[in-house]
Every structure is written in C-alpha cells, then in structure tokens.
C-alpha cells in the first residue's frame, strides 16, 4: 500500500475581511491512525489554527464529519476572516503515539491572502 | 480556567526577576497565552504573547530585549523573565489567555505586583 | 499601529439609569472589538467580544454594539456592581494587541 500523501489542492485563496475562508486538506489512506492539525506559518513559530484531538476552536469549523470512521477530508472554513489571518496554512497528519503523537506528513501548504471590505 | 501568577515582588533597578503563571481548566497546550501589565493608577498594556508550540513569540516596543516569554506545557505553565528592569516596570502583571491564535484575552489572572524601586 | 480612544474617561450614573461608553479606533477594526470590566482591585474580565457578543455568564444588561470604527458598551440598567473601569480592546490588527484608556464608571 502506498504511503498517505497529504493533498492541499489549493496553492492560495483569497478572502475578503469579514467573510469565511475554505481551507483544503484531502489524505490519501486512513493509515496510519492519528490526527490532523491545521497550522498558521512553518517551524517552531507556527501558530496552531486547529486540533483534531482536543482544544476549543471557536472560528474554525470542518467540512466534513472528522468522527466518520472512514473520513479521508480534512477541509476546514474559518470565519470572519481579518488581516492577521493572512499566512501559509498548513494541514499536518500525526500518527497515533505514546504518550504522544508523532508528525507524520505536512500538505504542501496553502497561502491565505485577505482583502480589505469593499466599503 | 484558572490563572495563578507568582514571582512578583520588590526589586531595584537593573534586576532581574522571573514571573510564572500557573493555569488550569484548560487544553494549556493549545492556546496562546499573553501577559498584559498595569501601572499604578494607569491603564493596561499588552506586554508580550506567546504561541500555542512556544515558538513564536511577540512583544511590545517597550519591553523588547530585555523581557523574554516562555511556556510548559507539559507543566502548564506561563513565564516572563523580566531583566534590566526600570522604575517604569512597575506594576501589577497578568497572564492572560488568548480566545484563539488571533482573539481577544477571554480569561485573566489575578496579577502579581511588580516593584522596580531603589 | 491602530489607537483606541474611549469616551467619556469618567461617567456618573444613577442606579437603574442606562450607561452608554463610546470607544473609537483610528482605522477599521471590523467587529473584532472586546470589552473588558475592571472592578477597583481586582483582575480583567471579558464581558464582549467580537462587538456584540456577551461573554458566558455576562448579564443581559450589557450589550455591545457598533463595527468598523464606531462601538458602544451600554448598560442598560446600572447596577451599583456595576461601579468599575471598562476597557476596549481590538484584535483585528496585531501585534501589538491594543487595549483604549478606559472609561469609569461611577454610581451617582
């Protein structure tokens, strides 16, 4: 079986301030077993946008259904967008660990560009 | 959510000190934490963040190279090292955790004073 | 760097009489404004965010309103617990996260 790959399709996307931005994420297997996160930028600077595991994240929602067994996308919407969202977004698989889980494959990343409201 | 601070206390000029702030009732781990000071009398004044990994870190204009922000998540705890300090540090310091990675501050310690004096 | 500036910096109300605070930024913070409540001697605490949403547990005679540049704090029936300094504070841009001077309000 060939290695999950972590596929965010899109390179960028803009997004006017206020409104909600649809960031892609698609893997390619369910193995191996673990979650995903979402990151703002790369490196030991990275902001974390969303845990799969635990943590409240309140602006963020999932396209899909993430508790679904067979569930291979991890798209999320983030709302009322604003300037300090702009960034490269990053979809991270982890595989399950003890006692934690280890990162396992990053997307290729997907820049989030924001404009100002048209007033 | 409860936030703990300790550490302050009366220090001369050119000291140093180290703050902690002990949180509980949370995912610690999974939110970036700030500390915001006030000056007797004054108003508040965002003084440094932190990310949720401890990586990235922010500061204000005023405090830049001579504070550093830290954290533990494995311990749940929330750090100011504070050097070369002035008379103009003088205040109460709380931690404060931020609603999400770009949020308003939705839970606040009680604070701990900080006294710069000679 | 945007700059918050709240109005009036003290207001005298009596007791179940409406309070309206004023906080105004100097470029657009969309409706990524808060307020917090300070009572004398005591810690922060968040009663709005995102302009017009109450925080948990907030009674429902704050309310806040506004968006862009222009927002409102009102209490709608001053309570004397009510007596403390509120502050504004955006998050639309940073850093650095700003916070307005304050406003105090005190029971006539």
């Known amino acids: 079986e060939e290695e999950l790959q972590v596929i965010q399709p899109d390179k960028s996307v803009l997004v006017a301030a206020g409104e909600t931005a649809t960031l892609r994420c698609t893997a390619t297997s369910l193995i191996p077993v673990g979650p995903i996160q979402w990151f703002r930028g790369a490196g030991p600077g990275r902001e974390l946008i969303y845990n799969q595991k635990e943590g409240h994240f309140p602006r963020v929602t999932t396209v899909s259904d993430l508790t679904k067994r067979n569930n291979m996308d991890f798209s999320i919407r983030i709302g009322n967008i604003t300037p300090a969202d702009a960034g490269t977004y990053y979809c991270v698989k982890f595989r399950k660990g003890s006692p934690d889980d280890v990162e396992f494959k990053s997307g290729a990343g997907t820049e989030l560009s924001v404009r100002a409201k048209p007033s | 959510v409860q936030l703990v601070e300790s550490g302050g206390g009366v220090v001369r000029p050119g000291e140093s000190l180290r703050l902690s702030c002990a949180a509980s009732?949370?995912?610690?781990?999974?939110?970036?934490m700030n500390w915001v000071r006030q000056a007797p009398g004054e108003g508040l004044e965002w003084v440094s963040r932190i990310n949720s990994g401890g990586g990235g870190t922010d500061y204000a204009e005023s405090v830049k190279g001579r504070f550093t922000i830290s954290r533990d998540n494995s311990e749940n705890t929330l750090y100011l090292q504070m050097n070369s300090l002035r008379a103009e540090d003088t205040a109460v310091y709380y931690c404060?955790?931020?609603?999400?990675?770009?949020?308003?501050?939705?839970?606040w310690g009680l604070g701990a004073l900080v006294t710069v004096s000679s | 760097e945007t700059v918050l500036t709240q109005s009036p910096a003290t207001l005298s109300v009596s007791p179940g009489e409406r309070a309206t605070l004023s906080c105004r930024a100097s470029q657009t913070v969309g409706s990524k404004l808060a307020w917090h409540q300070q009572k004398p001697g005591q810690a922060p605490r968040l009663l709005i965010y995102?302009?017009?949403n109450r925080a948990t547990g907030i009674p429902d005679r704050f309310s806040g309103s506004g968006s862009g540049t222009d927002f409102t704090l009102t209490i709608s029936s001053l309570q004397t617990e009510d007596s403390a300094v509120y502050y504004c504070?955006?998050?639309?841009?940073?850093?650095?996260?700003?916070f307005g001077g304050g406003t105090k309000v005190e029971i006539k």
């Open positions: 504070q955006q998050y639309y841009y940073w850093p650095p996260y700003r």
């Open positions: 404060a955790k931020q609603y999400d990675w770009n949020g308003f501050f939705d839970y």
């Open positions: 995102d302009a017009t």
């Open positions: 009732g949370f995912s610690f781990s999974s939110y970036a």
